[in-house]
């Protein structure tokens, strides 16, 4: 399963390009631009599982830092500040990582 099985390559390219500048990442705008916001719950979960590289059932902080690479391999890494901001937004239960339901909520709230 690759990201382009769920999202269009064109939308991915546009969204990655829009946040190419350092410290410009805004997860709400990104999820909208990449087309994730309008996907159904099962498709959102598929995206989660792609981003969960080590199949732990969670997107941990280091995986969050490379979240853009999960959409496009040539994308940049998030800065430490961007990563912390994203983690704080998504980690509802305070365990330091984002589970599938938390990710779904994060997308839905975008």
């Amino acid at each position: 399963m690759s990201m382009t099985d769920v999202l269009s390559a064109e939308d991915i390219k546009k969204a990655i390009g829009a946040f190419a500048a350092a410290d410009s990442f805004d997860h709400k705008k990104f999820f909208q631009m990449v087309g994730l916001k309008k996907k159904n719950p099962d498709e959102v979960k598929k995206v989660f599982h792609i981003l969960d590289k080590d199949k732990s059932g969670f997107i941990e902080e280091d995986e969050l830092g490379s979240i853009l690479k999960g959409f496009s391999s040539d994308a940049r890494d998030l800065s430490a500040k961007e990563t912390k901001t994203l983690l704080a937004a998504g980690d509802k239960d305070g365990d330091g990582k984002i589970g599938v339901e938390e990710f779904s909520t994060l997308v839905a709230e975008s």
Partner: antibody, heavy 117, light 107 residues
Amino acid sequence: EVNLVESGGGLVQPGGSLRLSCATSGFPFTDFYMSWVRQPPGKALEWLGFIRNRAHGYTTEYSASVKGRFTFSRDNSQSILYLQMNTLRTEDSATYYCGGGRGLGYWGQGTSVTVSS
Amino acid sequence: DIQMTQSPSSLSASLGERVSLTCRASQDIGSSLNWLQQEPDGTIKRLIYATSILDSGVPKRFSGSRSGSDYSLTISSLESEDFVDYYCLQYASSPWTFGGGTKLEIK
């Protein structure tokens, strides 16, 4: 296809040393935590610890039962995990497994270690 | 350390029967719990991760759930290859800990 293959098990005398290897393929090794788990004959699984991924500086965590005697290392260029076991005791006799990922989603087939005089 | 108390330690059941295995966590582990299957030759395979996510290729008769500190693995209709050993594993905090295991035997 993900593959983990342990090797290096065998018979060793109490007080002796042994190094186990876990050759891996099919996943981004440097992104993965790698664990060692053992199972004494007829008993439950026991987690020995892990070596973290590149993002966490390949730092290690050990269980109390092996801390100070066992050492984890990894060759990231070859995607191989190692377990150096020193001052072995009879109670270290077990099948040793390597496991990949923070959720231990990938497992090797195990290698048997017998510590006996 | 977090203790994982797994029950029952052994279970006799018939083909087609529905069975549930349980692990109780001594401290909060959130959803950081896996269920593993071990065959007689020692081969270990993860069935369920993060409490309820089915691993790729695992039959849909397996499912995982949680009620408070109790975590369950349910097999909806036992097949012959299911009569092996099962372990839970918590990976919420170090040291990661396993349950004592359940041996599932054919009646």
